[in-house]
Every structure is written in C-alpha cells, then in structure tokens.
Interface confidence: medium
Amino acid sequence: VKMAETCPIFYDVFFAVANGNELLLDLSLTKVNATEPERTAMKKIQDCYVENGLISRVLDGLVMTTISSSKDCMGEAVQNTVEDLKLNTLGR
Amino acid sequence: EICPAVKRDVDLFLTGTPDEYVEQVAQYKALPVVLENARILKNCVDAKMTEEDKENALSLLDKIYTSPLC
C-alpha cells in the first residue's frame, strides 16, 4: 500500500511545500479551494523550507516518508484495505 | 484517508511546542541531523506564522482531509 494512495492531495501539498515549488503549491491548493489567507499560511511554511536549503527538504521528506511507511500507518492502511475488501465482498 | 500518525505530526508541527514536535519526530527517525532539522523548521514556522496563520493552515488541512482527493 503506497503512502500517496492513502491521501494523494495531502502528499501533493506537502511535497510542493517542502520542494519550495510555488507553482505546484498553487495548483495543489486550487484543487481543495484554498482561500487566500490559507494560501498565505502555506507559503509562510514553504519559506522556511526554502530558507533552510535543499537538505531541509530532503530531511523532512525523510521524516514524512518514514512516518507514512511506519507500522503506525502501514498497519492502518492494511486494516483499511481489509475493511474495504469486507465491504466489497458483502456488497456483492 | 490520512494516517493518524501523519495527522499528529502535522498538528504538532503547527500547534505543538518545538520540544513536543521534535519528540514526535524522534519516535520515527532519530538521526541527529534529522532532529536538528525538525527543530529548526519548527522554530522558523513559529517565528513566521501568527496564530491566525496557524488557524488558516489548520482549516486548509481540514479541507484536505475531507476532500474527495484524500
């Protein structure tokens, strides 16, 4: 179960913020109808990544990847998949 | 649906203290350079963002979590 499959829009926004890509961030935020104050808030977070340089993006990306692929999340994802399978089976 | 552990990480990044956030990160990735980086990012966000900014970021996260794309 890939982490991005659990909530793709979250990871789109996270990696746009962490990569310092303003265009990508705008595109991702448009998909969830972000208001102007919400966009401003996210750009302030993005500024911190940009100011701290490439390694900051890499290291925080590692944290997010590690949490997302940890037992805490993978167990959850597997459980959700089992529940989905049960529902699909019952629905037939 | 977003994993609760990821949600907790993001919530602490915005609303927790630097120590709380770094402690949370340490549970998953305890490399010294990673923890140092986490603290610096957290301190930067706390310095740049007003309470209103943080509320706006949290309301955006709610939109993300409840989006059909999540």
Epitope: N52, G53, L54, I55, V58, L59, L62, T65, T66 | K29, A30, L31, P32, V33, V34, E36, I40
Partner: antibody, heavy 120, light 107 residues
Framework: QVQLQESGPGLVKPSETLSLTCTVS????????WSWIRQPPGKGLEWIGY???????NYNPSLKSRVTISVDTSKNQFSLKLSSVTAADTAIYYC??????????????WGQGTLVTVSS | DIQMTQSPSSLSASVGDRVTITCQAS??????LNWYQQKTGKAPKFLIY???NLETGVSSRFSGSGSGTDFTFTISSLQPEDVGTYYC?????????FGQGTKLEIK
C-alpha cells in the same frame, strides 16, 4: 567526482590557533553537511564537528570551547579553527562530506588528510 | 557520549580466510552504524552503512550485521588488498564516535 582538499600550516606553536581550510571541487557545498575529523598518529578517529552551508554548526563537546567551523559558499570552502592548541592536538586532520539517506548518515567522501604538528 | 568498543584490536589471517570483527556500543544505537577501511597513509574509505548495507562499488566479500548494541563486520574470503585498519562509527547520537580500530594483517 567530488574531491576534498585540506590546506593550512603543518606546524603550529603551543597556545596558538590551528587554522585549516577544506576546498570542495566537483560538487556544490550547498547541499550537504561537512565535517572535520582528526586522527592522532597511530591512534583512532575523533569527530570534531560539522557545518551546514547556512553556517549552522554542531561540535564535539570535548572540543567545543576551542573549535570554530565556518563556511564560505562563494569559494566552496569550509574552515576549522582550533584555539589554545597543545601537543595533544597533533594529528592528521581530515575534512569529509556527510551523506544523509533515510536511515544513514555517513562520511562518504574524505580529503587525503593533512598532518598538523603542535610544537615550539 | 556513546562508547564504541571494537575487538580484536589486531588480527592476522591467511588469504582466503573468513575474518570477523565485532563492535559493541555502550547504549542502543538501533542500526545506526557504519564501517570504514583505512589503509596506511590514506583516508578512511566508506564500506557499509546502516549496519548491513554495502556501499555502491564495494566488494561483496564485505558484509555487516547486528542491531542495538552488538555488531559484526565480516570478510568472507580475505584478499591481500584487504590489509588495513577497520573502524566502526555510530551516528545514532551526537557526538559521532568511532571504535578504536582493528588492524588486519596477512599471515
């Protein structure tokens, strides 16, 4: 291919300040952490400290009061200063690059090392 | 500081022998351990990261294992070019620390 080259005086008098520079070629200094490590003749390795291109540093507590590491991104160089030296600071001084991956933090590239002798 | 204790401090083996070096950490370091090889008059060379992962381009006769506090470095079939001193290095906590080294010679 990344290459690191240490430079500086090979002889320093006791109580003076040891100054070394590491020049990085074949890659940018801006994307990594960079360390100084030393090795007294015939002995083991001791980490001195690291620097990130932004100027952020972390030093070994055993040397912290005497160490300063700085960076000059325009020259792709980082430097070490060790004050109040004694004969115990006689060592080969290496500069090295950190490679940080998801679970690892390694010194993947090293300079060839420069011997610094503390003697009057 | 985390103390790293290597053993033996020196060893002599014949070409083709299987050679094992151990490294013990004074506290749990997960698998945050590297191994380096240093030949006389040269800078250390990075061999293994994460306790057991071989660095790209390093011979597969080198291997590592262990987690927590006890780690092992193995050369499956000793070659003349393997002569040198081997160091373990922990990066689980600052300051980074190294083992005192194991000097490997050919009989």
């Amino acid at each position: 291919q990344v290459q690191l080259q240490e430079s500086g005086p090979g002889l320093v008098k006791p109580s003076e300040t040891l100054s070394l520079t590491c020049t990085v070629s074949g890659g940018s200094i801006s994307s990594y952490y960079w360390s100084w490590i030393r090795q007294p003749p015939g002995k083991g390795l001791e980490w001195i400290g690291y620097i990130y291109y932004s100027g952020r540093t972390n030093y070994n507590p055993s040397l912290k009061s005497r160490v300063t590491i700085s960076v000059d991104t325009s020259k792709n160089q980082f430097s070490l200063k060790l004050s109040s030296v004694t004969a115990a600071d006689t060592a080969i001084y290496y500069c090295a690059r950190h490679r940080v991956t998801r679970t690892a933090d390694s010194f993947d590239y090293w300079g060839q090392g420069t011997l610094v002798t503390v003697s009057s | 500081d985390i103390q790293m204790t290597q053993s033996p401090s020196s060893l002599s083996a014949s070409v083709g022998d299987r050679v094992t070096i151990t490294c013990q950490a004074s506290q749990d370091i997960n698998n945050y351990l590297n191994w380096y090889q240093q030949k006389t008059g040269k800078a250390p060379k990075f061999l293994i990261y994460d306790a057991s992962n071989l660095e790209t381009g390093v011979s597969s006769r080198f291997s590592g294992s262990g987690s927590g506090t006890d780690f092992t470095f193995t050369i499956s079939s000793l070659q003349p070019e393997d002569v040198g001193t081997y160091y373990c290095h922990q990066y689980g906590d600052l300051p980074y620390t190294f083992g005192q080294g194991t000097k490997l010679e050919i009989k």
